[in-house]
Structures are given as C-alpha cells and as structure tokens.
C-alpha cells in the first residue's frame, strides 16, 4: 500500500480467483485513543473500533473511503483504491490502446516545435467518475523539471456503438534550449481512478521523436501564362522555432482530386514555393517536416486549383 | 558563444554540401545498423544515449544562432579553447566566433573518426563479419574536416590488447551512430544558418 | 495485370510524320497520366511529353514542342504519339508510360522502334 | 533544364558483392529523384521512387539515398538477373530528364 495524495491509498493486489488479498492496517488520524468506530462509504455499519483497523482487501467491494468516528463526529478518512496485477502486468482497462505507432501505446504525445512545450492525449470509452492526474520530467534518476497543467477533456467521438472521449494536457519543460541535443528523456507518468480503480501510465520519449509541425500558411496561386502549370507559395507556421535556417523545415506539395486513388502531382521542396499542374476539381496541398531530422509530416494545408 | 550575423556571402560556404553529405551518411549507416542488427539493443529506446565530445567541445553552445543566446537555457558556462583558423571561412568578415563553433565541429569530426576507425578494427576481426562501417560515411567525414581545414594535432587511434568483445562492440556502435546522428543534425542547422546568413 | 501494348516498329523518310499507338489494358485508362520516352541506340531516356486522357491535357518538351502532338482516344483505351519533319537523329525506340503520379513512370510499354532513313 | 550525370557509366561487378552507382543533379532537386532497370531489348522497370521509397515486387536488395543533388543507388548484392542498365530521373520540373545510364556487368 502506498499514498497517491492526502488519505489517499493505493493498494496494489495480485488478481486471480482465490487470491489472498493485502492485509491493510488503517490509522484514525486523531490524538483521540477510546471510542472510535470505522465505517466504509456511505453505510452505517460499524466494521470494528479503535484507533487502528486491520481489514483484508481482496476485491473492490473492500475498498472505498473508510472513516473513523467518534460520538457522531468524523476525525478522519481514508481512500482505499486497488491497482490490479493480473499475470505480473499492471491493468490498463481505463485506456484505451491507441496501437500507434504501436500496439500497448496508451498515451501519444507531440510538439508543435523545440521549445520545450508539448501536448499529449488520451482515450477512454469511460464518461463517469473518471479523473486524471500528470506529472513529468526529463530524466527519471536526476529529474529535471517539466510543468503540466490540469488534462482536460478535448474532444468527444461516436465510434460505432459506443462514445470515445479524448483527454488531453500541455506540458511545458521548465529550461529548454530549442537547440539542445537531448539525452535524456522526457517521462510522462498518467494517473488514472474511475470509482476505486487505479491505474498509471507511462510515456518515455525525445522531444525531437515527436516533432510535428504546423502545417504551412499563407498558401497563394499564381498561374503561369501559357502553362498549366501553377506556382504555389506559402510560409512557415507562426509557431515553428526560429530562426528558420537553423530550424529548416522541407515540404511536399501536392495536387489532388477529392478521392485518393486519383492521378495526381507530387514534389517535395526545401523552398517556400513549387510549380506544379493544377487539374480542374482538385486541390494543392502542402505540408512541412523537419528538414534534418524526420519526425512526423505535419497536416495539409489546402487551397482548390481553381 | 554565439553565431554573428556576418558570415560568408550566400552560396559560398563550402560546408553546407558536405554536412548535407555527411548528415546522409551516418542515417544510412544507423538503418543499416539497426536492421543488421535487429537482435541487439540498436534502437533509439532501447540505447544508453552517450555523447563522447561531452567537456571535451561545445559545439550546440559555441553555434548557438544569435537569435537564441537570449534564451537563458541555452547558455552553457562550459569553456573550451579552439584553434582559430579554417577554409570554410570564405569570408575576411568572419569573426572569432564563427571560427569557434566551426573549430568546435572539426574536434568533433575527428573524436568520431578515430572512436569509428578503432570500431572498424574491431568489427573486421569478428569471425560472423556482421557488419562493418560505411566507407562512405568514413569518406564525407574526411572530406567535411578537410573542408574545414583546421589544423589540430593527430589524435593516435586507439588500439587495444585484449581480445574485442563483438556483442559489447556491436552495441557501442549503435550508441555512437545515434549520438553522431544527432550532433550530424546540429552541424547541419549550423552550416544552412551560416549559409543564409 | 496492367499492360501498355505499343504498335510496331515503323521505316520514315526524313521530313515525314509518324504516329504511334500504345493501347492499354487492365485499370481504368483515365485515371493514368500518359507519357511518351525515347531511346536513340546506345543513348539514354529522352522525355518527350505527357497527357492526362480524361480532359486531353497535355505538356511536351521544350525540344519537342511544335513538332509533336499527343492524344488519347478513352474509347480505345489508346494513346498516340506523332512525331512530325522527322530527321536520322529522331532513330530510336519510342515508349510510352504510365503512372497515377505525373512525374515518374510505374508501367512500360514494349517500345517501338521508329527509324528515320533516306 | 536540370542536367543528371550518372557514374560510373560502366561498373563490372563479381556476382554477389555489392554495387553502388551515383546520379548528381546540376541543381538541388530535393528528393525528386527516380531508379529505373533497364535489360537488352527490354522496356524500363522502376526500381525506387523519390530517393529511398521501395517500390512493391522489387527485391529489398535495391536501396536508394540522397537528396539535394547526390544521390545513390546500392545493390546490397548483385543476383545474375541484375545485371542491366540503372537510370536516374529527376522529377523536380519539366522537362523531366534522365541520366546517361550506367552499365552493371559481370567482373
């Protein structure tokens, strides 16, 4: 058994039929020593008396939030939460797995830049009695720090018969140097708890490994006389570091119809312009990636041929 | 420690292709690794990350674009002497910063071709021959020192008695390619910044 | 199986035309772009132009430009390449090639070898 | 137009080691560049699309690199059907130009 936060209790169970269970020693936070009783949640059953109870937590009908009492007065509470280790592996039943880049990938994260600042997220099909907690740093021996703020619920999805809700958090590492080389990780540790459930999980990763920039703005056609050939140009996004030879970016630009399987024109770029064919019905677009250092594509920016 | 402004005139900053070159080579040559060796600890996650310049050159701190050395976090106090003079410097408005940072990744260059060439004798007396360093990446090493051109003393290779433990050798070189890739990114922000400058 | 099959080899006369066809089978004709690619002997690839044969788009070469013309006839499924004031150097096999992409080639026909001789 | 030098245009190679065959552009091209095999009387077949993307049915022998203005074509080891002509096409504007070609034969 550990503490999570302030009478807050995790107790950590090996769960099989017939398990054991932990037994858990719980102390009334009071100078009183005569007098006490226990009580679980809401119910007014009296589960023993003294300063100190002893209860074998098994499932999770023995866990919840224990108070102490004395002559109708609360002293004090205790929340029991159970981790659940089925097979000598932790439960991830809150999550669910994004299975990218790869299977058991719970948490994703990405940055819009070098700055330090990045965002990860989360799903789960759960809607109720749900919270979260994050923390992070770089490194996990030494910790250097990395601020989070609260994860919040950013977007909901229908996905066949059942609802998806996204959560998210920004992060923001405390001294970064856009320039750096890292060494050392970031770590990002979620805590989740729906109703007595706990469980956590873990991210490790660079922030050069999750680079994905804005796509590019700006995006202008001009026609070539006597061509059909278009020249497009665009910008780098407002929130890519600086300065821009240093922190280059590369681009593919592309013509396409509405459908991917059709024909299309297709060229990449280190240059913030491109000519290429436009076709009636189709779109240009462009996206950017780092130049020296592929990470991920950022999404298209789009403008019609017409 | 930072970059000037005034650098070389666009286009005649002879670094820019070999770095481009040399940032190539060492990808190709970690892809190759990491398949090659597909049973050994050769991924990015999976390494210890090591930087063998570590106190021995500066060279993110003393190439720090102008525009970051009012970033706090980016000024190292670390302190590293150089020796000032060099081909890449095409231009008399060249300051002594520049050469600095250009001296810094020719210490580089050279702590990597040695640390590679000793690897090198090693792997090429493993009897499963299961790989071996690109002569290619070897080759735009050498051609990017020579076109920096800083003289500095040899730096002897390291030879060793004892008999060389492949598996230990294999995933030493997994962790020198991927730190040599990454300081290979910083050279080449370096040189495309000096080039538009 | 997509296939491009060309027709066969041609003799012109210098000063004349010539007009070769490549029929395509398997995929739907429209959604390719078209191109035609030359080989003099013991020379490499020349570019010669392209069309898009669902609206009739086409791009030549500069070297080509005025002297050939590309076309498609979607109810055949068959391109056509015309070379016009055909000269000795103009010798070569002529291919045409396909890709959904507009820049390179997946898919070869066999080649037709057109000879320019007096 | 952009110029594509090929070398070496002639490389005899022992059946089993390695080839390696470079292709320059005269201007930098990004990663539009294109391999194609070419055998005797045969029509062209791609080998790899823009630098290093392998194409389907191609054997994973063949490896592209490069961008900017060098770029590489390596056959880890040389099969006896891969002797043949290997041209380069750039794809980064019209018109689009091919290499010399280099010639792959046995040693």
């Known amino acids: 058994i550990w503490e999570l936060k302030k009478d807050v209790y995790v107790v950590e169970l090996d769960w099989y039929p017939d398990a054991p269970g932990e037994m858990v020693v719980l102390t009334c936070d009071t100078p009183e020593e005569d007098g006490i009783t226990w009580t679980l949640d809401q119910s007014s059953e009296v589960l023993g008396s003294g300063k100190t109870l002893t209860i074998q937590v098994k499932e999770f009908g023995d866990a919840g939030q224990y108070t102490c009492h004395k002559g109708g007065e609360v002293l004090s509470h205790s929340l029991l939460l159970l981790h659940k280790k089925e097979d000598g592996i932790w439960s991830t039943d809150i999550l669910k797995d994004q299975k990218e880049p790869k299977n058991k990938t719970f948490l994703r994260c990405e940055a819009k830049n070098y700055s330090g600042r990045f965002t990860c997220w989360w799903l789960t099909t759960i809607s109720t009695d749900l919270t979260f907690s994050v923390k992070s740093s770089r490194g996990s021996s030494d910790p250097q720090g990395v601020t989070c703020g609260a994860a919040t619920l950013s977007a909901e999805r229908v996905r066949g018969d059942n609802k998806e809700y996204e959560y998210s958090v920004e992060c923001q590492e405390d001294s970064a140097c856009p320039a750096a080389e890292e060494s050392l990780p970031i770590e990002v540790m979620v805590d989740a708890v729906h109703k007595l459930k706990y469980e956590n999980y873990t991210s490790s990763f660079f922030i050069r490994d999750i680079i994905k920039p804005d796509p590019p703005k700006n995006l202008q056609l001009k026609p070539l006389k006597n061509s059909r050939q278009v020249e497009v140009s665009w910008e780098y996004p407002d929130t890519w570091s600086t300065p821009h030879s240093y922190f280059s970016l590369t681009f593919c630009v592309q013509v396409q119809g509405k459908s991917k399987r059709e024909k299309k024109d297709r060229v990449f770029t280190d240059k913030t312009s491109a000519t290429v064919i436009c076709r009636k019905n189709a779109s240009i677009s462009v996206r950017a990636q780092d130049r020296y250092y592929s990470s991920s594509w950022s999404e298209w920016a789009s403008v019609p041929c017409s | 420690r930072n970059l000037p402004v005034a650098t070389p005139d666009p286009g005649m900053f002879p670094c820019l292709h070999h770095s481009q070159n040399l940032l190539r080579a060492v990808s190709n040559m970690l892809q190759k690794a990491r398949q090659t060796l597909e049973f050994y600890p050769c991924t990015s996650e999976e390494i210890d990350h090591e930087d063998i310049t570590k106190d021995k050159t500066s060279t993110v701190e003393a190439c720090l674009p102008l525009e970051l050395t009012k970033n706090e976090s980016c000024l190292n106090s670390r302190e590293t002497s150089f020796i000032t003079n060099g081909s890449c410097l095409a231009s008399r408005k060249t300051s002594f910063m520049m050469a600095l940072c250009l001296s810094s990744i020719y210490e580089d260059l050279k702590m990597y071709q040695v640390e590679f060439k000793t690897m090198n004798a090693k792997l090429l007396m493993d009897p499963k021959r299961q790989i071996f360093l690109d002569q290619n990446m070897l080759a735009v090493i050498d051609e990017l020192m020579q076109a920096l051109n800083f003289n500095s003393e040899t730096v002897p290779q390291k030879s060793s008695l004892e008999e060389p433990d492949f598996y230990k050798t294999k995933i030493k070189l997994c962790i020198l390619l991927h730190a040599f890739r990454i300081r290979a990114v910083t050279i080449d922000r370096v040189m495309s910044y000096l080039n538009a400058s | 199986q997509v296939q491009l099959v060309q027709s066969g080899a041609e003799v012109k006369k210098p000063g004349s035309s010539v007009k070769v066809s490549c029929k395509a089978s398997g995929g739907t004709f429209s959604d390719y772009y078209l191109h035609w690619v030359r080989q003099a002997p013991g020379q490499g690839q020349e570019w010669m132009g392209w069309i898009d044969p669902e609206n009739g788009d086409t791009e030549y070469a500069p070297k080509f430009q005025g002297r050939v013309t590309i076309t498609a006839d979607e109810s055949t499924s068959t391109a056509y390449m015309e070379l016009s004031s055909l000269r000795s150097e103009d010798t070569a096999v002529y291919y045409c090639a396909r890709n959904k992409e507009l820049r390179y080639f997946d898919v070869w026909g066999q080649g037709t070898l057109v000879t320019v001789s007096s | 137009d952009i110029v594509m030098t090929q070398s070496p245009l002639s490389l005899p190679v022992t059946p089993g080691e390695p080839a390696s065959i470079s292709c320059r552009a005269s201007?930098?091209?990004?990663?539009?560049l294109h391999w194609y095999q070419q055998k005797p009387g045969q029509a062209p077949r791609q080998l790899i699309a823009?630098?290093?993307q392998s194409i389907s049915g191609v054997p994973s022998r063949f490896s592209g690199s490069g961008s900017g203005t060098d770029f590489t074509l390596t056959i880890s080891s040389l099969q006896p059907e891969d002797f043949a002509t290997y041209y380069c096409?750039?794809?980064?504007?019209?018109?689009?130009?091919f290499g010399q070609g280099t010639k792959v034969e046995i040693k």
């Open positions: 823009f630098a290093s």
């Open positions: 096409q750039q794809s980064n504007s019209f018109p689009l130009t």
């Open positions: 201007q930098s091209i990004s990663i539009n």
